[in-house]
């Protein structure tokens, strides 16, 4: 009887913690990265940033995966995704090439089955960076709550790369699960 | 054999209570803060904000604590934290010394166990603030995942705390855990 | 006893599954939901926007209601609150009233049964947009955690509509529940 | 060297007009708001204008509300005070001063020219 | 308009002496005073702004306290060069005014 008790425990122990698993114990995936500043393309139109920390200072990732300047979704689920671009500028620096400048962030999709990219978030904002002060500075944000499905490729394209401020506080972007698909 | 049956429930019902209580009844951590307009600092470099609301209106605080003007973690874990940072100008608020301003947020951790203190995110804007206006605005938000653990300190430093809008809706930062440490 | 066992693990099984349900395995309520574009009103003062998509694209909503251009709470809870809302102008959509704009964001909770709205967030900026640029853009973002009740409604308010950027990953604003009130 | 020299001060009759002007060199014109503050003889202090680092915006107490005006051309880091309607109680020595980085609502005085004086007299 | 009053208008001390001269704001100005020095037939120096805190390359025996309404500026030891008016300066709201002065002079 007594083991027939204990048999009819561990398949509760079993069932329930197998579940507390699959629902929040099992380690929810995210990710934090931040800028790598020695590999700044240049350029004044929309380019994709491709070098980015994912395991050094505030960067870190887990139970997804970062390659070739993606972001890869390992898991199903509903995802919170951010991002924030800071651009500056000092006169040390060198002249702009024009002082009507379009400062703008994407956060784009690509689906690697159906081979498509479509943009999910953006932001930004055009500014005019007159030669009349020494120092500019400015910075987006963007957030949103977005169903990605595993394999999945989350990049991040700016306008004006050569203007990224390069430090880990200022230019970053960053994704955790937040639940599963139903 | 029926108490034999009761023991056995009681050590299933109490072992995955108290799992389930670590996975997420366990009330999670968080806090919306707003500001506190009665005491806000001047100066135009960096200060940090000590004055924050923690139990009226939007605010509220639970499993972490504010004290000297920093949001202390008492719990290790993953947290989202944001700010939104409103700056304003009328005419009629006093005699605006500069047109040229650097609105700037600074949201810090800092780690009384080994004293440091570091910018986990910033953001901001230069702006040209003309007379040709009567009234000036600009709002910065941030927000990011960051591993926070017990004992350390979040902070909020701004530029110009003077042009600081005190609305509770304006000018607030937060946090709340996601998930646990492995 | 065999059966006795049986009826114990059924009342174990049950009772943790329930608190499970309860737990996380609910599935919790989110929304992000994108503007409609076919429906903004005009004008350069605040309006509320009641034109949104819940259904298509990047749209989606969960054990909550879009109803009457409100996004209703069905379960109590604390929630992360976000918007995103873009403003742009080129020449060719015709000359600006004025150059001098106040380009604001207002996400508003409005409670039924003690009729009242309130201001949650709210972010923007002034711009200067001249006639010396062809283009002009800029974007809000703005979010915070907030207490949300059953029956509470959900609003986006912004000034100047008429200058709304109206692609899905322009202007958008959801929420998504963190928690339990406790 | 760090200097503000004052210019334009005379003799004037009540109801009469004067422009003042300061030369500023050593710093970065631009980034400073300016003032101009005066002193009767034997008497305290009295700000009597200030205008922004960039000129747009401009100040001034009711005493002198109307009858002065501050600009500044910061091509030729150049400040001036324009004095019309004129009375006996502006007779003064004229300071021109430059307002100390700080809070931007907040002025005080960093740097002081050694001034320039002004009679009105008939 | 935000008026300051200060005493004494004069006073009289010994070189070593320590030396107060007090400024009474007719509202609360939190910490936003500022203390200059003017010796005859020269410009102002500024000593002391935001109540205490000491400009660049001013003398340590030099210092301001205060807040709200009261202030005070100390020397602690006077010297023969610091013989000038003193006046203090409110810059907490336009338009920006000033104290009477206090006038000191070596016994």
């Known amino acids: 009887g007594s083991q027939h008790i204990r048999a009819e425990k561990a398949m509760v122990d079993g069932s329930w913690l197998d579940l507390a698993k699959r629902s929040k114990l099992e380690a929810q995936p995210f990710a934090h990265l931040t800028i790598n500043a020695t590999d700044i393309p240049t350029g004044s139109h929309k380019v994709s940033l491709s070098s980015w920390y994912h395991d050094r200072g505030w960067a870190k990732i887990s139970n997804m995966t970062f390659s070739n300047g993606k972001l890869i979704v390992n898991q199903d689920g509903f995802y919170y995704l951010y991002a924030n671009i800071c651009f500056r500028h000092h006169e040390t620096s060198g002249d702009l090439a024009t002082e009507y400048l379009q400062l703008m962030v994407y956060v784009t999709k690509t689906s690697i089955k159906i081979p498509s990219s479509h943009t999910l978030m953006k932001g930004g904002s055009t500014k005019y960076w007159s030669g009349n002060s020494e120092f500019h500075f400015y910075s987006i944000n963007v957030g949103g709550f977005f169903k990605l499905r595993s394999g999945e490729e989350i990049s991040v394209e700016v306008s004006n790369p050569s203007l990224l401020d390069p430090d880990q506080d200022a230019t970053y972007f960053g994704a955790f699960k937040v639940r599963d698909i139903d | 054999g029926s108490q034999h049956i009761r023991a056995e429930k009681a050590m299933v019902d109490g072992s995955w209570l108290d799992l389930a209580k670590r996975s997420k009844l366990e009330a999670q951590p968080f806090a919306h803060l707003t500001i506190n307009a009665t005491d806000i600092p001047t100066g135009s470099h960096k200060v940090s904000l000590s004055s924050w609301y923690h139990d009226r209106g939007w605010a509220k605080i639970s499993n972490m604590t504010f004290s000297n003007g920093k949001l202390i973690v008492n719990q290790d874990g993953f947290y989202y934290l944001y700010a939104n940072i409103c700056f304003r100008h009328h005419e009629t608020s006093g005699d605006l010394a500069t047109e040229y301003l650097q609105l700037m947020v600074y949201v810090t951790k800092t780690s009384i166990k080994i004293p440091s203190s570091h910018t986990l995110m910033k953001g901001g804007s230069t702006k040209y603030w003309s007379g040709n206006s009567e009234f000036h605005f600009y709002s910065i938000n941030v927000g990011g995942f960051f591993k926070l653990r017990s004992g350390e300190e979040i902070s909020v430093e701004v530029s110009n705390p003077s042009l600081l809008d005190p609305d509770q809706d304006a000018t607030y930062f937060g946090a709340f855990k996601v998930r646990d440490i492995d | 006893g065999s059966q006795h066992i049986r009826a114990e693990k059924a009342m174990v099984d049950g009772s943790w599954l329930d608190l499970a349900k309860r737990s996380k395995l609910e599935a919790q309520p989110f929304a992000h939901l994108t503007i409609n574009a076919t429906d903004i009103p005009t004008g350069s003062h605040k309006v509320s926007l009641s034109s949104w998509y819940h259904d298509r694209g990047w749209a989606k909503i969960s054990n909550m209601t879009f109803s009457n251009g409100k996004l209703i709470v069905n379960q109590d809870g604390f929630y992360y609150l976000y918007a995103n809302i873009c403003f742009r102008h080129h020449e060719t959509s015709g000359d600006l009233a004025t150059e001098y704009l106040q380009l604001m964001v207002y996400v508003t909770k409005t409670s039924i049964k003690i009729p009242s709205s309130h201001t949650l967030m709210k972010g923007g900026s002034t711009k200067y947009w001249s006639g010396n640029s062809e283009f002009h853009f800029y974007s809000i973002n703005v979010g915070g955690f907030f207490k949300l009740r059953s029956g509470e409604e959900i609003s986006v308010e912004v000034s100047n509509p008429s200058l709304l950027d109206p692609d899905q990953d322009a202007t958008y604003f959801g929420a998504f529940k963190v928690r339990d009130i406790d | 060297e760090v200097q503000l020299v004052e210019s334009g001060g005379g003799l004037v009759k009540p109801g009469g007009s004067l422009r003042l002007s300061c030369a500023a060199s050593?710093?970065?014109?631009?980034?400073?708001?300016m003032s101009w503050v005066r002193q009767a003889p034997g008497k305290g202090l009295e700000w009597v204008s200030g205008i922004s680092s960039g000129g747009t915006y401009t100040y001034y107490p009711d005493t002198v509300k109307g009858r002065f005006t501050i600009s500044r051309d910061n091509a030729k880091n150049s400040l001036y005070l324009q004095m019309n309607s004129l009375r006996a109680e502006d007779t003064a020595v004229y300071y021109c001063a430059r307002r100390d980085y700080g809070d931007v609502y907040e002025w005080y005085f960093d740097v002081w020219g050694k001034g320039t004086t002004v009679t009105v007299s008939s | 308009d935000i008026q300051m009053t200060q005493s004494p208008s004069s006073l009289s001390a010994s070189v070593g002496d320590r030396v107060t001269i007090t400024c009474k704001a007719s509202q609360d100005v939190r910490t936003s005073i500022a203390w200059y020095q003017q010796k005859p037939g020269k410009a102002p120096k500024l000593l002391i702004y935001s109540a205490s805190y000491r400009y660049t390359g001013v003398p340590s025996r030099f210092s301001g306290s205060g807040s709200g309404t009261d202030f005070t500026f100390t020397i602690s030891s006077l010297q023969p060069e610091d013989i000038a008016t003193y006046y203090c300066q409110q810059h907490y709201s336009s338009p920006w005014t000033f104290g009477g002065g206090t006038k000191v002079e070596i016994k």
């Open positions: 050593g710093f970065t014109f631009r980034n400073y708001a």
